[in-house]
Each structure stands twice: as structure tokens, then as C-alpha cells.
Interface confidence: medium
């Protein structure tokens, strides 16, 4: 296969929610029409899929029902929102960009996103 | 050189099943999609399943979906189609091919003969 | 599916002539196209790529040319060995499909 470049941020806080957003930049070689994007997470060496999408250019992500992703895509940007995220979700968050098709067929993998999640304090007793 | 050599065809009942296999040397397989394409008797081509060069993605004609399932055995150079349900609109010559890196279907194999009749 | 009309369905030529097959899909493919050359009892084999490359191995007699939904193949000196049966193929969007074909018969 032929090698991709694919650029995503370095570091991202997720919020109070646990939700994370980044941004997953390919840059695209030709006109693919089919585009598979999947992300993996990395801790302590192990690699683990946390969703994936195919799409057809110009139409939206469609992740699983039961996914923790979202995403939409416009030309070689996918924009992704992990959910449910808590502090034990800590870690590397790689973007992987597959051209499906037509060929050739292009594989490009982000050096990795570095989501941080804080789990929320408790909140206090109310008096009232 | 590449060479790809189709086996397991040959007369099937309707409703039946069968496993095509495709033994490919000369390249390195791994690193290349596959797919089946089919040609009935006096007919023209039609594309049946691909498998991505890991086997990880799969695609099929809509004729087959259901019924034929591509697969691949990279330790064995070896690609697969299993056929159920066959009806007698699958008789046709089943080729195996390869898909190069810059386009479909670079090279083909002899093809094997699936007769499907009661 | 992307539709792929190729004509003539057939065409009786002589050695030496020039011949010309065309192809036309029902969507812009945007030059992902094949032509295939199959012989009888034979497997097909690859001609020309992308629009326009020629496979290895392919003599330069065969040539391809076109863009958006017509597509030409056209071979300049026809050979006793080019009598066969040709089709084009797209692969700009899934499924791959073929032309109905085009046999190439001796005058």
C-alpha cells in the first residue's frame, strides 16, 4: 500500500462530560471515493480499535449504534467527538486513514492525539 | 512471474454449496486486494466479491451477498469463495484476480467451471 | 451501479486496419478505466489502464484515450492475435462494472 500523511493535534482536555473533539486532517493523494477511519487508543503499549467509519465522500460518518464516536467529514477533514470518556480513558488516541477506493489504495496513520479526561468532583451536600 | 490457479469447481445441485480456492504465487499476496470475477457461458464479466490484502474488508455483488462469502488464508496464499444456495444463474467460469496497487485487475487467473443443475 | 455501454457489440475487420472501440459510463469516472482483451476459453488479460497506461508486456499498437463519460480504445494496426473480445471496466465507484463487450472478427 501507499503511505499517507495524516496530521491530527497533539494534545486534547476533554470536557466536564467527558466528551473529546479533535480534528483528523488527511492528505488526500487522489479523488477517493470510499474512506474508512478508525481510532485506535494506545496505553501502556497496547493498542485497542475504539470505533471506526466508512464513508462515502460527501455523505456523513456513520458510525455503529452502540459506538462512542461521532464524526462528520468535510473534503480531507474528519472532524471526531469521543463520549463517555472517563479518567481511566487517559491516553494516545491514533487516527488511522484508509482510501479505499478506487485504487491505489492509501493507508496513513496520525502520530496520535493525547486526550486527557478528569473525572468530575463530586458534587457538595446542599443545605437545602 | 504471477500466477494464480483456481480449483474446487465443477457440477453442483441447485440449493447446494462449494469452496473455490485460488492459489497465487509470484507475488508477495499479502500486500495485494483480491477479488472473484464470474463469466456465465457466452456471456460478459461480472465482478463478485473483494477482500482487502489483510482480509479485514470484504465486498460483495449485490447478487451474492448472503449467499457467497470472500476470504483469504495469507500464511497460505490462498484466497477463497464459499458458495451456498447456489442457483442455476451462478453456472458460470469463476476467476480469480488480483487488484494492483494503481488499478483493478491486473492479472487473472484460468478460471474454474461451476455448473449449478439439478 | 455505474452502467457501461460499449459498441459496437461487434466489428469484422482486416489485418492492418484500424480499429476503434468505444465506452461509455453512466456517471463520470474520472479516467478509472480499464480495457481487457479475452481470447476464447482463455482468461481476460489487462490491456490499458487508467484511461490511457499501457500494461507491461502490452505492444504499442493498443492505445486509450477519453475523460469525464466516453472512452475509447483504438488499436492502430490490427494483428492476426489482436482478433478477440474486448471490454472496459470502471473502477471510480463500487461495484467494478464491465461492458457487454466488443468481439473483433476477421473481414
Known amino acids: 500500500c501507499k503511505a499517507m500523511h495524516v496530521a491530527q493535534p497533539a494534545v486534547v482536555l476533554a470536557s466536564s462530560r467527558g466528551i473529546a473533539s479533535f480534528v483528523c486532517e488527511y492528505a488526500s493523494p487522489g479523488k477517493a471515493t470510499e474512506v474508512r477511519v478508525t481510532v485506535l487508543r494506545q496505553a501502556d503499549s497496547q493498542v485497542t480499535e475504539v470505533c471506526a467509519a466508512t464513508y462515502m465522500m460527501g455523505n456523513e460518518l456513520t458510525f455503529l449504534d452502540d459506538s462512542i464516536c461521532t464524526g462528520t467529514s468535510s473534503g480531507n477533514q474528519v472532524n471526531l467527538t469521543i463520549q463517555g470518556l472517563r479518567a481511566m480513558d487517559t491516553g494516545l488516541y491514533i487516527c488511522k486513514v484508509e482510501l479505499m477506493y478506487p485504487p491505489p489504495y492509501y493507508l496513513g496513520i496520525g502520530n496520535g492525539t493525547q486526550i486527557y479526561v478528569i473525572d468530575p468532583e463530586p458534587c457538595p451536600d446542599s443545605d437545602f | 512471474q504471477v500466477q494464480l490457479v483456481e480449483s474446487g469447481g465443477g457440477v453442483v445441485q441447485p440449493g447446494r454449496s462449494l469452496r473455490l480456492s485460488c492459489a497465487a504465487s509470484g507475488f508477495t499476496f499479502s500486500n495485494y486486494a483480491m477479488s472473484w470475477v464470474r463469466q456465465a457461458p457466452g456471456k460478459g464479466l461480472e465482478w463478485v466479491a473483494e477482500?482487502?490484502?489483510?482480509?479485514?474488508?470484504?465486498y460483495h455483488s449485490d447478487t451474492v451477498t448472503g449467499r457467497f462469502t470472500i476470504s483469504r488464508d495469507n500464511s497460505k496464499n490462498t484466497l477463497y469463495l464459499q458458495m451456498s444456495s447456489l442457483r442455476a444463474e451462478d453456472t458460470a467460469v469463476y476467476y480469480c484476480t488480483r487488484r494492483d496497487y494503481d488499478n483493478e485487475m491486473d492479472y487473472w487467473g484460468q478460471g474454474t467451471l461451476v455448473t449449478v443443475s439439478s | 451501479d455505474i452502467q457501461m455501454t460499449q459498441s459496437p457489440s461487434s466489428l469484422s475487420a482486416s489485418v492492418g486496419d484500424r480499429v476503434t472501440i468505444t465506452c461509455r459510463t453512466s456517471?463520470?469516472?474520472?479516467?478509472?478505466l480499464n480495457w481487457y482483451q479475452q481470447k476464447p476459453g482463455k482468461a481476460p488479460k489487462l490491456l490499458i489502464y487508467?484511461?490511457?497506461r499501457l500494461h507491461s508486456g502490452v505492444p504499442s499498437r493498443f492505445s486509450g484515450s477519453g475523460s469525464g463519460t466516453d472512452y475509447t480504445l483504438t488499436i492502430s494496426s490490427l494483428q492476426p492475435e489482436d482478433f478477440a473480445t474486448y471490454y472496459c471496466q470502471q473502477f471510480g465507484k463500487r461495484p467494478p462494472t464491465f461492458g457487454g463487450g466488443t468481439k473483433v472478427e476477421i473481414k
Open positions: 477482500i482487502s490484502y489483510s482480509g479485514t474488508y470484504s
Open positions: 456517471q463520470v469516472i474520472t479516467n478509472y
Open positions: 487508467y484511461t490511457s
